[in-house]
């Protein structure tokens, strides 16, 4: 019997046309839903002149529709057993699962400023800069909306560059019509244990972002793992949002709409600092911010973006150092809220259900030739928005999974 | 086309003034800055003034502080050197440049000015 | 102030010589180098900006490199019209300032 099971669980989590898994694979059953929280300052002016602490007040959740577009140039490569395809993004908003909506205006850092200023460091271009920031009547902070923060704007400062620059910032700009990959994954047919695990992004087995083996592509996607999770396992996996692969170990067992599943988490010890996790030497890129690489729970992706000076971290600083969110003030962690689970099927390694959450925090410093930053005293890691990505399984697919894969085993 | 085209050189006494122009075509000089550059007879090149974007601050070299002024007439898409109590060791061709980041990728043929009793 | 130290200040080469001009700042410059030629009675001609990167129009036979303190402009084959000064400037900080200048003269 119980091998019987096996073997059907292991033809059908092949990622080949006709199984049940490559179905789901394709395009997600699940609704996905992004919910945003942003980080409106209070206190603006406090900041700029006296390089007080940034008083923060979040607000949201704004909520969008996320991943429901199927993946396309699905491409089976028969010879080395792994099928290609790109993941394209696209976000609607969901109004009446949002406080407001994509017009509510929020104080936030001005990114171009905190950007420019930090790409360029030497002291005669900083000059520059200050004429263009003046020029166009720019600040350290700037009102914005929800949908331009998210989705885009022109910036009035980089606009007055002479040069053909990108002129248009946006946390997650460009977002609608573009996709994320190409993912070259293997498709179980010869090996059931490699079934989902990235062997490419991008056509490279390394990100190009990092030293040693914290560059390397490691695990599936997190939206499945291969079959038969056991509770000792610990589950890698690689999220392109945070440009690195992580992991999560087991947490508890959880029922889910009748249906046993494992709850993976992720550790405070990925977050760790070399200190304390060794492993982590590799994530910490300089010396400055990071007090030595002594810091922990913010991880600089500048390297992946372009330069700008992008900090991610768990929302509200969880498990992260105290000297980070020292000059923040309005910030409360917690576990539950806060932390990044995921409850895998364990017999069919798929996510059934998850919760990512991750914030989005832009470094700015003093510069002593850019008059808006010229008063303060201090680097600041400024919170600009956490998010919340969340999937569970439907109903419907629940009693299907129920009916076919976990009653047949009971 | 980008120009930049020189111009108020001359001869002149120590102590005296010289207002050195710089008309600029194909580009604005707004957008850019000005910066005049100079070289005194078979010496090498001396950056002497700026003046920053969207009539921005002016900075100048120490050897000229006090002496000299850049400014720029907007309209008129002209910057300008005005160069008060020169002395011998002023004597060079003087250079507009155009520059954003700090190099210079266009430059004005030159005017000379002599400073000598 | 950051001063550009050029050498040699002069040299002699032939037609079709690999020829290299090296730059030394006083201080880290990264990489905002930039590289000029200069005939006589013209006005200076960008070659070459950040160190490294090809000013449009300048033929490929023209290369710089270097980052931080050390700077290099190297002619691959030397052609009659380089016979000229060469000059190196930073632009990292105010005030910009250039090297001495190398006059490269025919043997």
């Known amino acids: 019997g119980d091998l019987l099971i096996q073997k059907t669980i292991k033809k059908q989590v092949v990622l080949e046309e006709g199984t049940i898994a490559f179905k789901n694979w394709v395009k997600t059953g699940t609704e996905v839903y992004r919910q945003f929280w942003i980080f409106d300052v209070q206190n603006p002016q406090e900041v700029m002149m006296n390089s007080s602490n940034i008083q923060v007040k979040q607000r949201g959740p704004y909520t969008y529709r996320v991943r429901f577009l199927a993946k396309e140039n699905v491409t089976q490569d028969a010879e080395d057993n792994t099928v290609s395809f790109l993941q394209p993004n696209g976000a609607i908003f969901e109004p009446s699962l949002s406080v407001g909506t994509e017009a509510d205006n929020f104080t936030v850092l001005n990114l171009a400023v905190a950007a420019a200023s930090h790409i360029y460091q030497n002291q005669f271009v900083q000059m520059i800069l200050n004429s263009l920031i003046n020029k166009s009547k720019s600040s350290m902070f700037q009102v914005r909306t929800l949908r331009e923060l998210l989705w885009g704007y022109r910036d009035p400062f980089l606009s007055l560059v002479p040069y053909p620059v990108t002129t248009t910032v946006g946390l997650f700009y460009p977002y609608n019509n573009t996709a994320d990959g190409v993912y070259k994954v293997f498709n179980g047919k010869d090996n059931i244990s490699k079934v989902a695990i990235i062997d490419t992004y991008k056509g490279k087995r390394n990100l190009s972002y990092w030293e040693s083996h914290c560059d390397m592509i490691n695990g599936t996607d997190a939206a499945s793992f291969p079959p038969f999770v056991e509770k000792s396992q610990v589950l890698q996996f690689f999220s392109s949002d945070i440009c690195r692969s992580i992991y999560a170990v087991f947490e508890s067992d959880v029922n889910l709409k009748g249906i046993p599943v494992y709850r993976f988490v992720l550790p405070s010890k990925a977050f760790a600092s070399p200190v304390e996790n060794p492993d982590n030497y590799c994530f910490c890129t300089e010396k400055i911010i990071s007090k030595n690489c002594t810091s922990y729970g913010v991880l600089d992706i500048s390297k992946c973006k372009e330069g700008r000076p992008v900090y991610i971290s768990l929302p509200h600083f969880l498990y992260a150092s105290p000297d980070v969110s020292e000059p923040i003030d309005g910030l409360n962690p917690n576990e539950e809220e806060h932390r990044t689970y995921l409850d895998i099927e364990p017999i069919t390694g798929f996510t059934l259900q998850f919760a990512k959450r991750l914030q989005v925090n832009l470094l700015v410093k003093p510069s002593e030739k850019i008059q808006v930053l010229k008063n303060l005293k201090r680097n600041y890691i400024v919170p600009i928005l956490w998010l919340n990505e969340t999937g569970t399984i439907g109903d419907e697919k629940a009693n299907m999974f129920r009916s076919q894969v976990t009653g047949k085993i009971n | 086309e980008v120009q930049l085209v020189e111009s108020g050189g001359g001869l002149v006494q120590p102590g005296g003034s010289l207002r050195l122009s710089c008309a600029a075509s194909g580009f604005t000089i707004a957008a850019f800055g000005i910066h005049w550059v100079r070289q005194a007879p078979g010496k090498g090149l001396e950056w002497v003034a700026w003046i920053a974007p969207y009539g921005g601050d002016t900075y100048y070299a120490d050897s000229v502080k006090g002496r000299f002024t850049i400014s720029a007439d907007t309209s008129k898409n002209t910057a300008y050197l005005q160069m008060n109590s020169l002395r011998a060791e002023d004597t060079a061709v003087y250079y507009c440049a155009r520059s954003f980041f700090g190099y210079f990728d266009y430059w004005g043929q030159g005017t000379l000015v002599t400073v000598s009793s | 102030d950051i001063q550009m130290t050029q050498s040699p200040s002069s040299l002699s080469a032939s037609v079709g010589d690999r020829v290299t001009i090296t730059c030394r700042a006083s201080?880290?410059?990264?990489?905002?180098v930039a590289w000029y030629q200069q005939k006589p009675g013209k006005a200076p001609k960008l070659l070459i900006s950040y160190a490294t990167s090809l000013y449009s129009g300048v033929p490929s036979r023209f290369s710089g490199s270097g980052s931080g303190t050390d700077f290099t402009l190297t002619i691959s084959s030397l052609q009659p019209e380089d016979f000229a000064t060469y000059y190196c400037q930073q632009h990292s900080n105010a005030p910009l300032t250039f090297g001495q200048g190398t006059k490269v003269e025919i043997k």
């Open positions: 201080q880290d410059v990264s990489n905002w």
